[in-house]
Structure formats: C-alpha cells, structure tokens
Interface confidence: low
C-alpha cells in the first residue's frame, strides 16, 4: 500500500464557508431533453453544453435545440443558440471537438427530408464564432479529423461515399465509392475497405483494403478477402477470409499495409470475432472468440512484432461482437490490467496483471472486510469488480473503474467481495498501490471524480431520490467530508470536470422538476481555496511501484526495470496544481527468464520458467509454419517481452532452429507447403 | 442432502406479526442466498425478498417493504421471515427457497440466472380474525 | 417491475402428446429466466434455468428456449407425472416476478 501516514481524519477546516463562496448555479433556460457535454482544448476552460428536446407530432418531430457555451470551467454560461442560427442539431453525431489545442468544433445539423445534402457548423475559434456549411452529401458519421492536421477531415455519406475536406469542412470531395469502413492512420494516411458488388453486409470476407496517402489523389490496394480491419499503436491489423472454407485469419502489417504477415493465432468461424483490446506501439492484447455463443475467448498478448502470440488468459467474458467486455488498462500503474473471466460454474470472477498479461491472479481481499455469500470459504476470498458487463446487465453500478494517469497508483472502482461478483448492491473500493491493495472507501454506489491528479476525489451517492450532498476526500479516501451544495435537491445526471484530472472544478448535473416543468440545472464548486497553498517538497514521498517484498533486490521490477516516483502525502492538503507533472525515476534491471517470451515453436512447460520446443506443431500453429513468412520460422525459442528493458543478467540464448523442417501436415498438398504466401 | 426445512402453521390475528423459520442443511449455509415466495390459495407465486445470510442485506419487493423484516443467524444456518400488520390477504403458504442470484453468473453464456433450485416445504400461516 | 404473462392459462394435452407453453416479458430479461412446475400440495420445482438450461435431475423431454422477452416451455411427449402447474421467472431485474402459471391438464 502507498504511504498513508495519519490514520485518523483530519478534517479540513472552515470548508463549507470556502466552498459556499466557490459554488456557482446556473439554471438553462428550456426544457428537459436530453444533454450533451464537451471540453474544448486543454486547460481553455471552455465547455460546450447542447440541450435538445423532441416533441414527437403525428406527422414528423418537432425538435428544439440549444447551444451554451462556458469559458470558466462551467461557472457561468452564455446562450449561443443563435450562432447557429437556431438549428436542431443532431445529437447522435454529438459535437466532433478537434485534436489537442486546435479550438476546432463540428456540429452536424438535422435538415428537411428533401435537401441534396446535410449541413454543418464549423468553429476554429473555441465555439465563439461558428460557419455554416452546406455539404454536397448526407452524413452517415461524424465528421474524423486527421490526428495529424485538423484541417484534414473525413466521413462516409449514407450512399456510401467517402469525403474528404482538406479546408476543415469548407469545401468537400468524395475520393471514392462504394466505402464501408474508414479509419485515419498517421501521417494523414486513411485506410478504408470497399466493395465490388452488392453492398458492405454482402461483400463482408469478400472486402478490399485500400490506402491513400494523399488524400485521395492516389490509392493503393493492400488487401483483398478482407471481413474487417483495425488499428492499433503502431499495428495494423486486418481479419482476412481463408480459401478453402468460411473461417478468417488476422494479418498484421507494420509498415502501412506494405507487407503482410500471418499472426500466429487461432482462426475464427463466422459467429466468432477478434477485439483488440488494447495495443501500444509495443505490443497488442488480442481477444479470440471461442466458438459457439459462450460469451468468452482468449486473451493473447503479441510479440514487438505483432506477430508471435502467447496465451495470456483464458475463459475471458467478453459478450458477442461489439458486446460488453470488462477489460480496463489501469492508466495509473504501468502494465497493471483488470478484467473478468467466466468461470466454470458461471459466476464471473475479476482477475488483474501487474505485468501486461503475463500472469494474471485474482485481486487481494480489502482488509476489514467480510466475504458475502457468494464464497464458500468465508475467510478466503477476493475482490470482484463491475465494469462494463455488470453496466449493460442494469446492475446498480453508475460508474465503471477509474483511473488517471497522473494521479499514480489509484483505482476507484465498485466491487463486491466474495468467489465472484455478486448482484447486490455494491459497494465503491480504492487502491492506491495500482491494484495490489484494497480498502472499502464508500458503502453503497456512487459516482466519483478525481481532481487535481488525485489530490482531491469526489463521490456523489447514486440515488433515485433527489439530492444535495457532495462528499470530498483530500487524503485518497481515507476520509470523507460532505457539502450541502444547494438546498434545493436535483435529480441529479452527471458529475464533469475536464478530462485529464488536472483540474479543480467540478460540475453536478442536474434537473429540477416542479408540478408544470423541468429544468436543467448545473452546480460547479471550484476546490481552489480547500487546498489553499501549492505543494512543496516537504508534501511528497518517495514510493516504489509494484513494490511486493523489499528484502529482495529486485523489487518492483517489471518488465525489466522499476521505477520510484514522488507521491503526494496523504496527511498534505495542498494543490498539486494544473502543471503538475509526475516524476519518476526508472531503474533498469538484471534479465530473468521471466523478461523473455517464448518464439514460435517454444512454449513454457507449467511452473516453469524456460522454453522448451515443441514435439510438434498442430492447429493454428501448423498453419502459421505452413503459410507464415520464412523469417519468422528461424528462432532461438526466446524473444525479449515488448516494452522490456531489463540488461544483463540472464541471456538465454539457444542454438537457432530453422522450424521450416517442422512444417509438415497429412491434410495438406506437398506443392501448398512449399509456398511461402507474404 | 441439501434441504430446508420451515417451521410449522401459524393462525395469526389481523394486526399481528408472523416469524415464520428455515433451517438450511446439507451445504454451506453463507455460499447461497435465500428468497421468500409466497402462494395464497389458489394464487400463483409472489416472490417477497431476498437475504444474503454473510452480512445480512436484504432486498425487498416494494410491496412489503416497511412490512416485512428477513434475518439470518448464521450460527444455527436459519433465515426467518418477518411480516407484521397482517391482513385476511395475507393468508397464504410461505416459502424459503435457496436463491444463487448473489453469485452473479454471466450472461453472455445463457446462463444467467440458476433458478430457485431447493425449496421449503411451504409454512401456512392463516390470518383470521 | 417486470411483468411476466404466461399463456395459456389452461392447456388441455393427451399423454404422449406435445406441449408448448409460453412466457412474455413486459421488458427485455436476456436469459435470466427459470422455469417451475407445481404439484397440488407440493413445493414449486426447479425445471429450467438460464431459459434453456435442464436443472438437475430433470428428464429430457422437458426443454426451454427464447431470449430477450419471448420464452417457451416444451414438453415433448406428455407423462402422467407432468399434469400440474407451471411458472416462469424472470431475475434480469429486482423484484423478481412469477407469471401467472399454465394449468396442463389431462385432455
């Protein structure tokens, strides 16, 4: 656990009169609908907030939308409906706000059924001025912006076409037809799959890929029998369709779709699907189906290839294609993942890695707790978290797990502590060691936010009632103080503060409901004068991550090396303030089998740490050493882990083995397993 | 083998409570929650509530709430049942019935939810004045 | 709450013969679904779980299917034994909730 010097609660003073001073209502004329909210840039204070309200006629829908801009976080708000003309805007295209800092905002608008194209509103101005744009075709997405030029945009009409603007949305060009997926690589690179015959349903496993790198003056096809493709850190992937039957294969090109390898992972039928579940310029954790519909897969992690897969976690619950899986990169600790697995009996039960999905364990029983009735043992259990899967089953979960990058080692997240997640109602849990150590902060759900890289959190219990309490704790959640916002309660919404946790500024979303109308209504308390001095050197600590016995040198290595970083003390009331940047200080460490993976032909006998080859090759192995390209098949048996930076130490090195002799199959023709297919 | 086993007939005045029992044996008492459903003459099933014997929560049908109080005593592996300001309506045969909704089986696998698997033999409690 | 219709209320079957029971939801329950058979006199039992699942002990012939809000019972071929009452359940959301139960009876 990370350093928590006091145990008792030191309550922060005088702080219902600083933050009476620092709350900020506003009221939003019209009435309730439904309401969207976005930040534009970073650290601007800028909030863009659109209310709509539909009125369902006989004949068509009557719908009303609104436009309010803020310029201080939240505090106050100006009507700017009339910027855009007092048009509906189209809420399911929501607001495309441009990359980084461009102050760049699209707003697509509703338009009568006989018009020859949409419309837009473009503002490169923060939302202070807006142009309207009529467009020369209907849009079936949002408009993407180029992550590398946000004055490069793209999107797919309804007929299928796709446009390109290089003048952010001025003017537009339709670079080609028959479209049916569309994705911007870098360097202003768009990838997209395309159609010959019928339609994108029909042609699915029968698709083209294609790329242009200028925008549309030349293409180039880089794949053909393709089902879907995707990108991911430096990867590009893409589910090519086999020739003998209706099973499909992941290809894997890291030079843009120049050149192709196989990846060495199980082939899918078609009621089964790959996800991506999270990738880096390093390394890609693959999901693959199981067949049949058992609502689990796979997990496999990449080689720094993308190519060599080792089985990371079976039995993992992700629901059917585009459904609901619980995997969640935990942002505050490097290589720390959580997700969920169905076990036998089918209960789902949470498992975490410390180490990018090498080994995966369940999480450690928060102290002081009781194991519920879902566990056999009563003294022996874990904890269990809901995410997206218990979100989409209407379990009472408001939030999915949360944490931040600069608020180090912190996890908030609703669990249950039992043999498996349990339907009753949960209570939230907050680690502050990236998921080694676990405490009960709040009891019963809530909503939760963390300010000023984890110098502040805020909680708001979840409830049908109305309500007005906030609670906020400067000590990580050790200690809770609670604030009467308003005396009138709301309905409440949504908690927003500004992504990135820098901030200090909350927003509480709401609305009133009187006998005739409702109203929106939001409360923005500024924390600034809670932490009333900037930190010092004095308020921080030194804490080694991943640190889980420091009687032994190698302690907190992982992935070859460790890192000690500056944290802020939990006895400190003090702001860390917008520019606060966390240090670290990295370590490299000696190499231990446990930095390398096992190369194709290899695997790791259990509880056993060195790679020994395999007697044979069968199933999707085979394939790969059948049809793989004949660099990947000459190996050592080892290859470093991506991302690890260990030196030294252990090098294990073995005589190279050309695999080519191993590529022999019964089932196959002797003239296919000369072929070398790229 | 697995069974629970409830206590036995009640006659009850209007106004008056009831604490009906159910005594579980043949598998580990704090591993599975327990429902209550309740049968009036000649009526179908009307589930009442649910008590997780580890900490005690319950959750109740919104029907019974303010009405009806389930406890546990892990130590004698017993839930009881509680209903107070009993009514002529209330006149039914009451059920405790081994519920693993707590262990929240996954969806995706069809498999959802396992079913009140072992019931009670069923406690008739007559309101009457 | 969710309410759950259950039709028919009566079904009257010969031995041997087929039958189909229903079970509607008011709203989505995935596959959260049991379903129940109750003699005279007796406890309900455990049938069918997860809307397809056979619990323990029970015969073949006895099968669920459906998801979402459309549920059906089959029984394939009608014994003696199988005359009573039989109940859905729903426990996608809280309160749980029976169907007001199909009467099979002897035709």
């Known amino acids: 656990s990370a350093p928590g010097e006091d145990e008792e609660c030191g309550r922060v003073r005088d702080f219902v009169a600083k933050l009476a001073n620092n709350t900020h209502q506003h009221v939003f004329d019209d009435l309730r609908g439904s309401v969207s909210l976005s930040w534009v840039g970073d650290s601007t204070g800028v909030i863009l907030v659109l209310t709509t309200f539909h009125v369902p006629l006989v004949i068509m829908t009557f719908g009303q939308s609104k436009l309010y801009r803020s310029e201080d976080y939240g505090k106050n708000f100006k009507d700017i409906t009339d910027l855009i003309n007092n048009t509906f805007i189209r809420t399911e295209f929501g607001m495309a706000i441009g990359p980084e800092n461009s102050g760049k905002v699209v707003l697509t608008a509703e338009v009568s059924g006989g018009s020859r194209g949409g419309r837009i509103f473009r503002s490169s101005d923060f939302a202070k001025n807006f142009v309207q744009t009529d467009l020369p075709f209907h849009p079936l997405t949002q408009m993407m912006y180029s992550p590398q030029n946000s004055d490069y945009l793209l999107a797919l009409s309804t007929e299928n076409g796709l446009w390109v603007s290089k003048n952010f949305g001025g003017k537009w060009e339709e670079i080609h037809k028959a479209v049916c997926l569309a994705k911007w690589g870098s360097d202003n690179t768009i990838f997209f799959t395309t159609y010959a015959n019928g339609s994108c349903k029909a042609d699915l496993g029968a698709l083209e890929l294609w790329r242009t790198s200028d925008l549309g003056k030349s293409f180039k096809t880089i794949g053909v029998k393709i089902y879907s493709f995707g990108l991911g850190g430096r990867f590009l992937f893409a589910s090519v369709m086999a020739d003998k039957d209706t099973t499909r294969r992941i290809h894997v090109s890291t030079d843009q779709g120049d050149t192709w390898s196989m990846a060495q992972l199980p082939s899918v039928g078609q009621e089964q699907f790959y996800s991506i579940l999270a990738a880096n310029d390093d390394m890609v954790f693959m999901h693959v189906d199981e067949p049949g519909d058992t609502g689990f897969g796979t997990i496999f992690t990449s080689d720094d290839r993308g190519i060599v897969y080792s089985k990371s976690l079976d039995r993992h619950l992700y629901t059917t294609t585009g459904g609901e899986t619980d995997f969640t990169n935990v942002t505050s600790l490097r290589g720390v993942y959580i997700t969920s697995v169905l076990s036998e009996d089918n209960s789902i039960q949470t498992m975490i890695t410390f180490d990018q999905g090498g080994r995966w364990t369940h999480l450690r029983k928060p102290e002081n707790s009781e194991c519920d009735a879902t566990a056999k043992n009563k003294n022996e259990c874990s904890l269990h978290i809901h995410a997206s899967y218990s979100i989409s089953q209407k379990l009472n979960v408001p939030m999915a797990p949360l944490s931040e990058p600069n608020a180090v080692g912190i996890v908030i997240a609703h669990g249950s502590v039992g043999d498996a997640i349990s339907v009753m109602v949960p209570d939230v849990y907050i680690s502050d060691d990236g998921g080694y150590s676990w405490t009960k902060m709040l009891e019963g759900p809530h909503y939760y936010t963390i300010l000023d890289s984890g110098g502040i959190i805020v909680a708001i219990e979840h409830s049908s009632r109305p309500i007005n309490v906030i609670k906020f704790s400067t000590d990580e959640g050790q200690c809770w103080q609670t604030y009467t916002f308003t005396r009138d309660p709301i309905y409440f919404t949504g908690l927003a503060s500004e992504p990135g946790a820098r901030s200090m500024n909350i927003s509480i979303w709401g609305f009133t409901e009187s006998f005739l109308t409702s109203q929106w209504v939001s409360y923005t308390i500024d924390f600034k004068d809670i932490l009333e001095r900037n930190c010092e050197e004095k308020d921080y600590t030194i804490w080694l991550a991943h640190s889980t016995d420091p009687e032994d040198y190698e302690d907190g290595c992982i992935l070859g090396y460790k890192e000690q970083f500056l944290r802020l003390r939990k006895s400190s009331v003090c702001q860390n303030g917008r520019d606060y940047v966390v240090t670290k200080q990295p370590s490299i460490c000696l190499c231990s089998l446990e930095d390398f993976l096992c190369d194709f032909g290899a695997y790791r006998p259990e509880n056993d740490s060195k790679c020994v080859e395999q007697p044979e090759l069968k199933g999707h192995d085979l394939e790969f050493c059948l049809y793989g390209r004949e660099e990947h098949l000459t190996t050592n048996g080892y290859r470093k882990i991506p991302g690890d930076k260990c030196q030294g130490g252990v090098n294990p090195v073995r005589e190279v083995k050309d695999l080519k002799k191993k590529c022999t199959s019964n089932f196959l023709s002797p003239e296919k397993q000369n072929s070398k297919s790229n | 083998q697995v069974q629970l086993v409830q206590s036995g007939a009640e006659v009850k005045k209007p106004g008056a409570s009831v604490k009906v029992s159910c005594k579980a044996s043949g598998y580990t008492f704090t591993s599975r929650y327990m429902s209550w459903v309740r049968q009036a003459p000649g009526q179908g099933l009307e589930w009442m509530g649910i008590?997780?014997?580890?900490?005690?929560?319950?959750s109740y049908a919104q029907k019974f709430q303010g009405r009806v109080t389930m406890t546990r005593d892990t130590s004698t592996s017993t839930v009881y049942m509680e209903l107070s300001s009993l009514r002529s309506e209330d006149t039914a045969v009451y059920y405790c019935?081994?519920?693993?909704?707590?262990?929240?089986?996954?969806?995706?696998?069809?498999?959802?939810?396992?079913?009140?698997?072992?019931w009670g033999q069923g406690t008739t409690v007559t309101v009457s004045s | 709450e969710i309410v759950m219709t259950q039709s028919p209320a009566t079904l009257s079957v010969s031995p041997g013969e087929r039958a189909t029971l229903s079970c509607r939801a008011s709203q989505s329950v995935s596959s959260n679904l049991a379903w129940y058979q109750q003699k005279p006199g007796q406890a309900p039992r455990l049938l069918i779980y997860?809307?397809?699942t056979r619990a323990t002990g029970i015969p073949a012939r006895f099968s669920g299917s459906g998801s979402g809000t459309e549920f059906t019972l089959t029984i394939s071929s009608l014994q003696s034994e199988d005359f009573a009452v039989y109940y859905c359940q729903q426990a996608r959301l809280g309160p749980w909730t029976f169907g007001g139960g199909t009467k099979v009876e002897i035709k």
């Open positions: 008590i997780n014997p580890v900490g005690g929560s319950t």
């Open positions: 997860g809307a397809s």
């Open positions: 019935a081994r519920d693993p909704s707590g262990i929240a089986a996954a969806g995706p696998a069809s498999r959802y939810y396992y079913g009140m698997d072992v």
